[in-house]
């Protein structure tokens, strides 16, 4: 959960407010209480954002872009609060806002710099392209341009491709990494310096498992303590890759503690789930169960991917029948 907005105090009656796209923010302004209060909020010294005087709003000449998006804290004006409540900020709202307050005893002017950030939750994806394997860190909408770093076995990687597409108000970014034939663990970090928000994706490949037909297999999936916070909402998904595409076997939502299972031979241990262990069992294996199994634990702040490769071999009985 993130605050409505946060303030950074800078000199000369100027504050910086950082807001998030489509969220509501407060542009702060205070004055020494007095009668006959007049409040004018303006954008870039040109556009009328909000006017209040003689005890009520006067929005006849308000710039249309602010219509139905602004209000004051009317019960607190008499106590010296001229702050502006600003709904659904967009990147076009970035800039300098001036609050003019006049009373029977004084006039003050405050400047507030509004910066707007975007950080739609990134994702880490594992993809097969022909014979190559790729990890892709991507963020659908981010502003300003983020810092993306990759690590292999905790060592920074200098090679860092970034595919960027810019829309009117934000960037969409993909950062693919070729991991063909690697058994290393990988980590991708995406940082939005304005919102002071960091997301981390971590990929781990487990040793391959060889099983006989009709046996069962246990696949481990436990979050790394560095990232995992059980109080935070997260989702766990187990899926199997077949011919280049993943099909979901089961998933668990921490918010509702719901488990949904799509494969009847799949089982989860409730006791273990309560201990944040999302290891699973797949019973009665058959040859078509061979493949890659992916456990994805995701929250707003991280994605943890664990890959298991399972080889199912025919049992002796089946082999002798053939």
């Amino acid at each position: 959960i993130f605050p409505l907005a946060f303030f950074i105090y800078v000199p000369m009656n100027e504050q910086i407010v950082i807001g998030r796209l489509d969220e509501d923010i407060i542009l702060p302004s205070s004055f020494e209480r007095g009668s006959e209060v007049v409040i004018h909020w303006k954008y870039q010294d040109s556009y009328k954002v909000h006017s209040y005087y003689k005890g009520s709003d006067h929005l006849e000449s308000q710039d249309p872009r602010y219509a139905n998006r602004t209000s004051l804290f009317y019960n607190e004006i008499q106590n010296g609060n001229a702050s502006l409540f600003f709904r659904r900020v967009s990147l076009l709202d970035e800039g300098i806002y001036t609050c003019y307050v006049g009373t029977a005893i004084q006039v003050i002017t405050n400047k507030v710099v509004l910066k707007v950030g975007v950080f739609l939750t990134p994702v880490m994806k594992y993809e097969k392209r022909n014979t190559n394997s790729f990890l892709i860190c991507s963020v659908l909408s981010v502003y300003p341009r983020p810092i993306i770093t990759w690590k292999m076995d905790n060592t920074p990687i200098s090679e860092n491709n970034m595919e960027e597409t810019g829309s009117l108000d934000s960037f969409s970014i993909n950062s693919p990494l070729n991991i063909t034939g690697s058994n290393s663990s990988y980590e991708c970090t995406i940082e939005n310096s304005l919102l002071k928000q960091t997301w981390t994706g971590r990929w781990t490949m487990k040793d391959g498992l060889h099983k006989m037909q009709s046996e069962h297999v246990s696949l481990s999936c436990q979050p790394v303590n560095d990232y995992f916070s059980p109080n935070q909402d997260f989702k766990v998904t187990w899926s199997r890759m077949k011919s280049g595409t993943f099909s979901v076997l089961a998933y668990y939502l921490s918010s509702s503690q719901n488990t949904i299972i799509n494969e009847s031979r799949f089982s989860w241990n409730k006791e273990l789930i309560n201990q944040s262990d999302f290891s699973m069992n797949l019973m009665d294996l058959n040859l078509s169960d061979s493949g890659e199994y992916l456990c994805n634990i995701s929250s707003d702040e991280y994605t943890l991917l664990t890959i298991h490769t399972v080889h199912v071999e025919p049992s002796q009985e089946t082999a002798s029948h053939n």
């Epitope: 006959e36 007049v38 009328k48 005087y53 003689k54 003019y100 006049g102 009373t103 006039v107 002017t109």
Partner: antibody, heavy 121, light 107 residues
Framework: QVQLVESGGGVVQPGRSLRLSCAAS????????IHWVRQAPGKGLEWVAV????????YYADSVRGRFTISRDNSKNTLSLQMNSLRAEDTAVYYC??????????????WGQGTLVTVSS | DIQMTQSPSTLSASVGDRVTITCRAS??????LAWYQQKPGKAPKLLIY???SLESGVPSRFSGSGSGTEFTLTISSLQPDDLATYYC?????????FGQGTKLEIK
């Protein structure tokens, strides 16, 4: 202390133009709305026009709308009233007066000494 | 426009008297009313704003009251220096309008 000094008054023929000025000092000019108020000889007071602190809003009395234009130069602390198509009934002492704040309140905390405009053929 | 009507037009009173001037608006103006004093040959001076708030530096013998359409200016104890014409003014809405004035004479 707050000072408002009007100038530019004089005798002018009907239909002609005149420009009044008001020089302000002793306060932050760009923080306050300024009005023009006039008073015909031996008569009462009549509000003429207002311009807001930032020049964004201007309002006029019906009797002068379309003929008079109020303007300000915040860098020079001056206010002007351009009066066109003058009529005999525009004869008056013209005062510039400072609003309590931005110009939005509409009453007059400080006044200049006035300048006389006489419209006569 | 909102019409402002003052009464009386002229008032004669003695030093020390309590004097009341009335101002009536043609429609409700809430409390958005100011009173001014103008001495002969001088610019007006603000006495009262928002119907009852005393402007800084104005003697406390001046007071204002009323709201809506009926307002009064009271001088609790008339002084020789109070010889002047008094104007009410509404600032509820454009166009701002003044009363016709009340001329106060000292007996």
């Amino acid at each position: 202390q707050v000072q408002l000094v009007e100038s530019g008054g004089g005798v002018v023929q009907p239909g002609r133009s005149l420009r009044l000025s008001c020089a302000a000092s002793g306060f932050t000019f760009s923080d306050y709305g300024i009005h023009w108020v006039r008073q015909a000889p031996g008569k009462g007071l009549e509000w003429v026009a207002v311009i807001w602190y930032d020049g964004s809003d201007k309002y006029y009395a019906d009797s002068v709308r379309g003929r008079f234009t109020i303007s300000r130069d915040n860098s020079k602390n001056t206010l002007s009233l351009q009066m066109n198509s003058l009529r005999a009934e525009d004869t008056a002492v013209y005062y510039c007066a400072r609003d309590r704040s931005s110009g939005a309140m509409g009453y007059f905390a400080y006044w200049g000494q006035g300048t006389l405009v006489t419209v006569s053929s | 426009d909102i019409q402002m009507t003052q009464s009386p037009s002229t008032l004669s009173a003695s030093v020390g008297d309590r004097v009341t001037i009335t101002c009536r608006a043609s429609q409700s103006i809430s409390s958005w009313l100011a009173w001014y004093q103008q001495k002969p040959g001088k610019a007006p001076k603000l006495l009262i704003y928002k119907a009852s708030s005393l402007e800084s530096g104005v003697p406390s013998r001046f007071s204002g009251s009323g709201s809506g359409t009926e307002f009064t200016l009271t001088i609790s104890s008339l002084q020789p220096d109070d010889l002047a014409t008094y104007y009410c003014q509404q600032y509820n809405s454009y166009s701002y309008t003044f009363g016709q004035g009340t001329k106060l004479e000292i007996k």
